[in-house]
Amino acid sequence: IRAEKAMVDGSWLDLAKRSKLEAQPFAHLTINATDIPSGSHKVSLSSWYHDRGWAKISNMTFSNGKLIVNQDGFYYLYANICFRHHETSGDLATEYLQLMVYVTKTSIKIPSSHTLMKGGSTKYWSGNSEFHFYSINVGGFFKLRSGEEISIEVSNPSLLDPDQDATYFGAFKVRDID
Amino acid sequence: IRAEKAMVDGSWLDLAKRSKLEAQPFAHLTINATDIPSGSHKVSLSSWYHDRGWAKISNMTFSNGKLIVNQDGFYYLYANICFRHHETSGDLATEYLQLMVYVTKTSIKIPSSHTLMKGGSTKYWSGNSEFHFYSINVGGFFKLRSGEEISIEVSNPSLLDPDQDATYFGAFKVRDID
Amino acid sequence: IRAEKAMVDGSWLDLAKRSKLEAQPFAHLTINATDIPSGSHKVSLSSWYHDRGWAKISNMTFSNGKLIVNQDGFYYLYANICFRHHETSGDLATEYLQLMVYVTKTSIKIPSSHTLMKGGSTKYWSGNSEFHFYSINVGGFFKLRSGEEISIEVSNPSLLDPDQDATYFGAFKVRDID
C-alpha cells in the first residue's frame, strides 16, 4: 500500500512541479534613465531596473543589459517604449525622426542575434509645437531556450521617456516545450 | 489506508484548486459610449460593459468604473484605445492634440493611485483631411493584490471610438504570488 | 485498495490532461510576402507562414488563410502590423493614408464575421521624406470555440513590411471555459 501511495505521490509531485502556476518564470523591467546613451542611431539599451517600483523578476536573470532565460519554454514577450521631447530640452537636428524599437534574441551557443519583433513610426516633430510624444507597443509568443538572451534596441535613445510606466519590457512563460 | 488516501486526495484537491486553469480570473471590458465625458483634459473612464458582446468578467469585479481584483496574483494587463474624428462631427478647437491613455492602480488600504502603463502620441489633425484616426495599445505584467482597482484615464475622451473592437481594456491572471 | 488508487489516479490523470501546460494551443504566424494583394482598400491577408523562422503552431490549424481553433477556451490574441514606404518604391497615389488592421472571428456554424480588435492611424506621408514607417499592435482576451476562425484584414496591403519580425499575428490559450 505504501509503495502504491508513493507512486501516486510521485506522480502528483511531478505534476505539481510542472504545472504549479507559481513556478513560471517572468520579468518586467523598467528603464534606468541614469544611463541612457545619446545619438540618433540604433543602440542597445543596457540599463534596466529589475527590483524597484513595478520592476520584478523571477526564475529569469538580468545581466549585462540582457534578460537571460533560465528555463526552456514558450514565452509571451512584450515591450512598451515611449519617446518625448519638450522644446526646453533643446533643438532637434531634424524634424523627420525614425522612432523604433527592436526586441532581439541572442544565442550564446551560436553567437548570433535575431530580431523577434519590431515596431515604431517615422514622425515629423516640428519646432512649431512645444511638446511631442509617441509610444510603441509590441508583443508576441516565442520559443525560448535556457541561456538565450533578450535585449532591446531603440533609435534616438536620448528622446526616451524615463518613467517606469512609459518605457519597459517583459516576458512571462506560458507553457513548456512539448 | 483511508487516511493515507485522504491525505493524497487532500493534496490533489489543493493543487487542483490552485492550478486549475479554469479558476483563473480575467476581464475584458469594452467602452460604454452612452456616457463618455467631454473636454480635452485627462479624465477617468467609468462606463464600461462587462457582459455584452466581447465583454466578459470572471473572478474579478467591475464596480464604480473600476476593475477590482478579487484574487492575489500576477496578471497581464492590456488596453486598446482608439480616437477618431470626422469633419461632420464639428471643428476641432486645436489641430495639436495629445492623445493618451494611462492604466492606473489604486489601493484602498493606502488610498493612492499609481500609473502602471501609459501610451499615446501627439498628433496634428489638420482640417485638410476629412477623417482622422489613431489607436494606442499598451500591455504589461503586474503583481495585483485582492482589493486593488484598475482604471483607465484618457485625454480627449470626446474623440474616443465607441466600438467594442476599438476601445477596451482587460486582464488575466497568469500565476500566483510565491 | 486498488479501486481507491485507481480513483485517485483517474482524478490525477484528469487534472494532468486539463492543466498540463504543454497541452495548451498556440500559434504565431508571420507574413508570407510572396503573395500580398495590391490596392488601398481593406483586404483579408491569406498568406502566412506557420512553420519557418519564428512562425509556429500547435493544437490549432492554419487553413485557407485563417487560423482555426481546435479547442474551446479563452485565448489571448495579438497582431503586429508594420507598413513602410521608400521613395524608390514609387510615388504614392495620395499622401493621406488610412493604415489599419482588423482582427476578425468567423463562425462556420453561423456564417458571420465579427471584428474582435482594430487599430491603426491616419497618416500623412509626404514626398518631402524619403522613407516612411508605421506599426500597429493590438491584443485582447477572447472566448473562442472549436471551429471558429481568426483572420487579419488590413488596408493598403502593398505597403506591408514583409519581415517576420514586423508583420505577424498569434494566439495562445490561457484557460478553459468554465
Partner: nanobody, 126 residues
Framework: EVQLVESGGGLVQPGGSLRLSCAAA????????MGWFRQAPGKGREFVTA????????GYVDSVKDRFTISRDNTKNTLYLQMASLRPEDTAVYYC???????????????????WGQGTLVTVSS
C-alpha cells in the same frame, strides 16, 4: 558629397545689417543639418547657429540670440544668415557647414560637421 559656397560678406557699420547666403550643390540638401560658424582674427572657429533639416528647429550661441536669424530654403538648396544690430566683435570669417543628422539634437561642435565652405569675411567697423 555636398559642396558649399558662401556669399554676402562685406564691410558694414556697427548697428547695421547683412545677409549671408550659402549655396549647396551635390547631395540632397533637405537631408542635411546646416550651421554657421565664425573665426575671428587670431581665434579658433566657434559655433554661431544651426538649423534642422526641415527648418523649424534653430539653435544660437547666446551672444547672437535675438540679433541673428538662420533660415533655409530647401527648394533652392540655400542656407541664409540674417545679421542685425552688428557689433565690432562680430567681425570674422563666416563658414557654412553641413552634416547628416547623427545626433538627436542640433550639433554645436565643429567636429560634428562633415562639409565646409571656404568662408566669407564680415567686417564690422566705422
Amino acid at each position: 558629397e555636398v559642396q558649399l559656397v558662401e556669399s554676402g560678406g562685406g564691410l558694414v557699420q556697427p548697428g547695421g545689417s547683412l545677409r549671408l547666403s550659402c549655396a549647396a550643390a551635390g547631395g540632397t540638401f533637405r537631408n542635411y543639418v546646416m550651421g554657421w560658424f565664425r573665426q575671428a582674427p587670431g581665434k579658433g572657429r566657434e559655433f554661431v547657429t544651426a538649423i534642422s533639416t526641415g527648418g523649424s528647429w534653430t539653435g544660437y550661441v547666446d551672444s547672437v540670440k535675438d540679433r541673428f536669424t538662420i533660415s533655409r530654403d530647401n527648394t533652392k538648396n540655400t542656407l541664409y544668415l540674417q545679421m542685425a544690430s552688428l557689433r565690432p566683435e562680430d567681425t570674422a570669417v563666416y563658414y557654412c557647414a553641413a552634416t547628416t543628422p547623427a545626433t538627436t539634437y542640433l550639433p554645436r561642435s565643429e567636429r560634428q560637421y562633415d562639409y565646409w565652405g571656404q568662408g566669407t569675411l564680415v567686417t564690422v567697423s566705422s
